[in-house]
Interface confidence: medium
């Protein structure tokens, strides 16, 4: 570490005095200090020598002498006085430029290190510092005000108690910069718009910030508009507004709006489209299949995309049958608004019963007249089977009915002795029906086919079993022929309640 | 289409002060910017400033401070007043509108002539 | 304020010539501005707007070119009707500013 001679931490002199400073060190050596005149500075390998035959006020400061090779960095520093009565106060800067809630050091220094006891800071013209001012003095440095804030960019003064009365330094002007976080934020409004031609509109293009350095233009079609800016300044931000009214809009007003903002951080952008149609509009439009299939007891959400201007005067949603005047709840219908002009309707049928097959229109209408969109929901159900035996043109033979929906399909098993059910190790002849016949077959109802097999002979130990399947389960009777007469049965697990 | 027609004598004495009034027809008067411009005889245009329905104004630093905008939304009138008028001030002044870039719809111009 | 210079200030030319009007802006404008023409006792008519997009109703031998500083006005192929002043307009920043004019003449 260099070592000054002399090796005093301060030094007091008077003006017109003659000051030598001296820096040795293992190495050569260098001086910094405030810039001042009267220095002359000589070198001599490892020392180095400061000195002035007339020091003045101005070389008040803290001179320091660092050895450029160390690899520690080590300095050492002597801090001069050079106490002018007329001078208390060595002003090393006139503007201080810092960005909010950094530290301001205001650089004047005394002269006199006997006035630290009644120095203060003011704000030119002796007027006070404004509230919240948290500052700290050192004669070495000067004045430092604490985090500063954006409202304390003022012009100072340092003022020094000399023989009873006031001394004050040279004004400084603290600047102090809103710390910018990034481009203004912007805000353009409607996101969307649609018009009929010759109706008005509207578009505001709002931007702000912390800063009032900032600039906001609003665009169309990548043509800057020529709107005036409306300024204004609240919740500690300055905002700018573009107002564009279009009192009779036209096809030309149409296409794409920009608002643009920019500042030294950046830029944003944000923009929206403008639609101008000739007349009211209403479109009705579903992601959902309109013909739906579901199985009974589950339940179903209809939906409806509209989209529309001018919006909508009334909608709703109705069954159109066919098997009774119910209408759907007004409960179980809601609608979302995706944006100002297109909205998602909702029909929500919960645990479908039988007489909830049917046609359901949702009807829509706005201006641009009425419109409808119609869903035709058909339930399915696993078959149920029935079997009889009975004669036919003189032929014994058992009949079977089926109905269910989808179409079932039918087959018949022959097992050996008495079962509710043939199973495999139990079979000895299967029949598939390919064709079964259809008895009945209304839209929204359960399709019912009978299929016939001829039996020349009831076997009395054996099961005759018809079995009936479709994409949503399957369902069976076993026919057991017994002496006194045919017995039918139907297996347990089959009676079936929707 | 807006229409705009300017008012307001065509001789005004040295020092006295003029006042021009622009009626506007055709759209409401709260939805654009609405502006004055003048021509001194055989010279060029110079816009002279805006005003918004709000009362904001914004005037062409250039000239000097005597000129006053107002605006009389119940009436759809904006008016222009111009204080100890010289000679230099002989000029046709124009009002105009600015809806998306200056300027959309001029009124025909008024020729003011300043003279003792 | 941004000044428009506009050259030449005045053009003698015949119909049927294709004349070439230039106006520099003191500072980047990017291309925010318009070409109008004023005919005696007449307002001002926008041609060109955007500094290269054609105005509604204009014939298509006005065009405008450029960005930033300098802009031309081109009209192709004169016509009587096209004789009258022509003035470049700025509306970058405020105070909206104009060129001084080119009065076109016939030769």
């Known amino acids: 570490i260099p070592v000054i001679e002399p090796s005093v931490p301060e030094l007091v002199v008077k003006p017109g005095a003659t000051v030598t400073l001296r820096c040795v060190g293992n190495g050569s050596v260098e001086w910094d200090g405030p810039p001042s005149p009267h220095w002359t500075l000589y070198s001599d390998g490892s020392s180095s020598i400061l000195s002035t035959n007339n020091a003045t006020f101005q070389n008040t400061g803290t001179y320091r002498c660092t050895e450029p090779g160390d690899p520690l960095g080590g300095s050492a520093a002597i801090h001069l006085y050079v106490k002018d009565p007329a001078r208390p106060w060595n002003v090393l800067a006139q503007e201080v430029v810092v960005f909010e809630d950094q530290d301001a050091l205001l650089p004047c220094l005394l002269t006199d290190p006997v006035l630290e006891a009644g120095v203060s800071l003011v704000r030119v013209r002796g007027r006070p510092l404004m509230r919240h001012t948290n500052y700290s003095f050192s004669p070495w440095h000067g004045f430092t005000i604490h985090r500063a804030k954006f409202i304390q960019s003022q012009d100072y003064q340092c003022s020094a108690l000399m023989g009873g009365r006031k001394v004050m330094s040279i004004s400084i002007r603290l600047k102090v910069q809103k710390v910018i976080p990034g481009p203004p934020a912007l805000t353009l409004v409607p996101a969307e718009l649609v018009r009929i031609r010759g109706e008005a509109a509207q578009i505001v293009c709002s931007a702000s910030s912390v800063d009032v350095n900032f600039d906001v233009f609003l665009q169309h079609n990548n043509t800057k508009l020529a709107i005036p800016q409306q300024s204004d300044f609240h919740n500690n931000r300055y905002q700018k507004v573009l107002t564009l009214n279009l009192d009779q809009v036209d096809f030309q007003h149409a296409g794409n709006y920009s608002c643009v903002a920019s500042n030294v951080q950046g830029k944003h952008s944000t923009s929206m489209f403008f639609r101008v149609v000739e007349s009211a509009y209403l479109n009705l439009s579903s992601e959902q299949n309109l013909i739906q299939e579901v199985t009974v007891g589950e339940g179903l959400n209809l939906k409806v995309m509209v989209e529309a201007y001018p919006g909508l005067q009334g909608f709703n949603w109705t069954y159109l049958g066919p098997f009774s005047d119910h209408q759907p709840e007004p409960k179980l219908a809601n609608a979302t608004t995706k944006d100002t002009y297109r909205h998602t309707f909702t029909l929500s049928l919960p645990r479908l019963k039988p007489s909830e097959a049917g046609r359901y229109s949702f009807l829509a209408r706005n201006p641009g007249g009425w419109r409808a969109l119609t869903f035709e929901l058909t339930l399915r159900y696993p078959p149920e089977v029935s079997v009889i035996w009975t004669f036919i043109n003189g032929s014994g033979t058992l009949l079977c009915a089926a109905s269910g929906y989808p179409q079932p399909n039918v087959t018949w098993l022959q097992c050996s002795g008495h079962t509710d059910r043939c199973d495999e190790a139990q079979v000895l002849q299967v029949w598939d029906d390919p064709y079964p016949e259809v008895l009945s077959q209304e839209p929204f109802h359960k399709v019912t086919v009978q299929s016939l097999l001829t039996v020349e002979t009831l076997e009395h130990n054996q099961t005759y079993e018809c079995r009936a399947h479709n994409s949503v389960g399957s369902g069976s009777w076993a026919f057991i022929p017994i002496s006194a007469g045919a017995h039918t049965h139907p297996p347990d697990e089959f009676l079936f309640t929707p | 289409q807006v229409q705009l027609q300017e008012s307001g004598p065509g001789l005004v004495k040295p020092s006295e002060t003029l006042s021009l009034t622009c009626t506007v027809s055709?759209?409401?008067?709260?939805?654009?910017?609405w502006s004055w411009i003048r021509q001194p005889p055989g010279k060029g245009l110079e816009w002279i400033g805006y005003?918004?329905?709000?009362?904001?104004?914004n005037y062409n630093p250039s000239l000097k401070s005597r000129f006053t905008l107002s605006i009389d939304t119940s009436k759809n009138q904006f008016s222009l007043r111009l204080s100890s008028v010289t000679a230099a001030d002989t000029a046709v002044y124009y009002c105009?509108?600015?809806?998306?870039?200056?300027?959309?719809?001029w009124g025909q111009g008024t020729l003011v002539t300043v003279s003792s | 304020d941004i000044q428009m210079t506009q050259s030449p200030s005045s053009l003698s030319a015949s119909v049927g010539d294709r004349v070439t009007i230039t106006c520099r802006a003191s500072q980047g404008i990017r291309n925010d501005l318009d070409w109008y023409q004023q005919k005696p006792g007449k307002a001002p008519k926008r041609l060109i707007y955007?500094?290269?997009s054609l105005q509604s109703g204009v014939p298509s031998r006005f065009s405008g070119s450029g960005s930033g500083t300098e802009f031309t006005l081109t009209i192709n192929s004169l016509q009587p009707e096209d004789f009258a002043t022509y003035y470049c307009l700025q509306y970058n920043s405020y105070p909206i500013t104009f060129g001084q004019g080119t009065r076109l003449e016939i030769k």
């Open positions: 055709g759209g409401s008067i709260s939805s654009y910017y």
């Open positions: 955007a500094a290269s």
């Open positions: 005003i918004y329905y709000s009362g904001n104004t």
């Open positions: 105009a509108c600015i809806a998306t870039r200056p300027f959309d719809y």
